[in-house]
């Protein structure tokens, strides 16, 4: 179907900075330290290849990756197909974030990544600590009061939480561009669904208590005829593709070696268990620590608090996919009416979860709209 997969792309072994400079773009690399000691790599593409001479402040755009992913998501295609490069060439000051636990955010001032304590986090902490620290850093560095936030998948989830619970942070967001938004996962058809059959008392037994490696857990649910061909074999053993789904028709297969070498970028077992709880409950709420006593210690209440997206007044534009297994259209349908400042919505009927970052036609379907909307915002 796909022929042989040849690892021919040099970016396979590169880090984020190297990938950016490989394509001839300027790169700045920073370390942001969160309030609880996590050290997150943040990259900046201050301008494009052809507009370095333009003086004056450029609007700041911050890109936040999704579940099991990293900042490389935004730069894994050729420059004319990668959102980070497209935005830089359009005259914007582009910043790429990383969430704790991924390849580029696996250090802490107090804990080693070999320790259980390092991995005791979920998307709650990404919203509570990672986003504020990174956005504060960008605001200070650029001297600009506001920025445009682009999130994909879990990058939207932590945006919903942070901007609805932290009003001072919300004030710093000019517009929130949400790609494949995830709040509730009540209707998800992703294989993440299968994790809900694992009882809480057995989750750590099966997956450990540090980084999430599904090993061969999902094999029992994968149709063997789908996963028999060489390239599909590679996808079928990759946690990102297992959980998000994949669509061979819209992929540039010559870039698959890059996608596979940089993904999954890693997250904690606790984070995956939080997502499992969300599938089970059908609700958008904080991590359930497993007992009323434990929850009281963390939240001063016996049940984990719900996240209320109606409290988020940031202007938001939403793109979702009709074939998205993780951000199911029914869940998106529940989300949209709750957004008090929804300024745009587009459903792309044939898009799946990863098409928003890697599809060959993503510029036409999504990115050009974002560029236009940011430029309208400048006026």
């Amino acid at each position: 179907l796909f022929g042989k997969l040849h690892p021919g792309s040099p970016e396979v072994t590169m880090n984020i900075s190297q990938m950016i400079t490989y394509w001839g773009y300027p790169n700045e690399e920073y370390e942001v330290v969160t309030e609880d000691g996590y050290i997150l790599e943040v990259n900046r593409i201050p301008y494009g290849k052809k507009n370095s001479g333009n003086t004056g402040q450029r609007p700041v755009v911050f890109l936040q990756h999704g579940l099991l992913a990293s900042a490389t998501n935004w730069i894994s295609n050729l420059p004319n197909n990668s959102l980070a490069f497209i935005l830089a060439d359009a005259g914007y000051d582009v910043w790429l974030g990383n969430s704790r636990g991924n390849t580029w955010a696996r250090r802490n001032l107090y804990y080693s990544p070999d320790s259980v304590e390092f991995w005791a986090f979920s998307f709650d902490e990404m919203a509570k600590y990672d986003l504020p620290a990174t956005i504060d850093f960008i605001v200070k560095k650029t001297g600009q009061k506001q920025l445009h936030y682009v999130g994909h998948s879990q990058g939207t989830t932590i945006g919903f939480i942070a901007f609805s619970t932290n009003p001072s942070l919300a004030k710093r967001i000019k517009t929130f561009y949400a790609l494949a938004p995830v709040a509730t996962v009540k209707y998800t058809k992703s294989l993440i669904n299968k994790l809900r059959f694992v009882p809480q008392s057995l989750f750590k037994f099966i997956f450990g208590d540090k980084i999430f490696y599904p090993h061969n857990f999902f094999d029992q649910f994968l149709a063997t005829e789908v996963c028999s061909r060489e390239m599909l074999n590679l996808l079928c053993s990759n946690a990102l593709f297992i959980i998000c789904g994949f669509d061979s028709k819209n992929f540039n297969t010559s870039r698959l070696d890059v996608y596979l070498s940089h993904n999954p970028a890693g997250t904690s077992v606790q984070n995956m268990f939080h997502w499992t709880q969300a599938v089970k409950s059908g609700k958008f709420q904080a991590y359930d620590w497993g007992s009323p006593v434990q929850n009281r210690m963390h939240y001063d209440q016996s049940q984990p608090p719900y996240y209320n997206v109606t409290a988020m007044n940031v202007p938001i534009a939403v793109w979702n996919g009709g074939k998205d297994l993780l951000a199911d259209p029914q869940d998106v349908g529940l989300l949209l009416p709750k957004l008090p400042n929804l300024i745009y919505h587009k459903e792309i009927p044939f898009y799946n979860h990863l098409d928003f970052i890697w599809a060959m036609d993503a510029p036409q379907e999504v990115y050009n709209d974002i560029v236009s909307m940011i430029s309208e915002d400048k006026k």
């Epitope: 320790s115 009882p199 809480q200 037994f205 208590d209």
Partner: nanobody
């Protein structure tokens, strides 16, 4: 030193039954969870069934309705009753226990394995 010892493996005909046992010794704590994995030469070790100290169980799809996991918490012992055995159940079966004195000192403890061979 915590040690896990499996027993009960052997050769059985397709459709037959076996009962595997695994006993822990040297442990100063009760395991939070115990379970069984299996491995065929050249393949990854795979989960078969697990049981928590709260009695919650998990089975992989291929053994549901045929295998039953049980546990004696006080003895840190786990059993796997295997019936309607198939040739594809042939593997080395390993016992695993997970526990520790605190949530930050939990470890996985493994047995040496016991061979189960199902002939057609």
């Amino acid at each position: 030193q915590v040690q896990l010892q499996e027993s009960g493996g052997g050769l059985v005909q397709a459709g037959g039954s076996l009962r595997l046992s695994c006993a822990a010794s040297g442990s100063t704590f009760s395991f939070n969870a115990m379970g069984w994995y299996r491995q065929v030469p050249g393949k990854q070790r795979e989960l078969v069934a697990a049981i928590g100290n709260d009695g919650a169980t998990y089975y992989v799809d291929s053994v549901k309705g045929r295998f039953t996991i049980a546990r004696e918490n006080a003895k840190n012992t786990v059993y796997l009753q295997m019936s309607s055995l198939k040739p594809e159940d042939t593997a080395v079966y390993y016992c695993k226990g997970r526990g520790g004195l605190t949530q930050y000192s939990e470890h996985d403890y493994w047995g040496q394995g016991t061979q189960v061979t199902v002939s057609s």
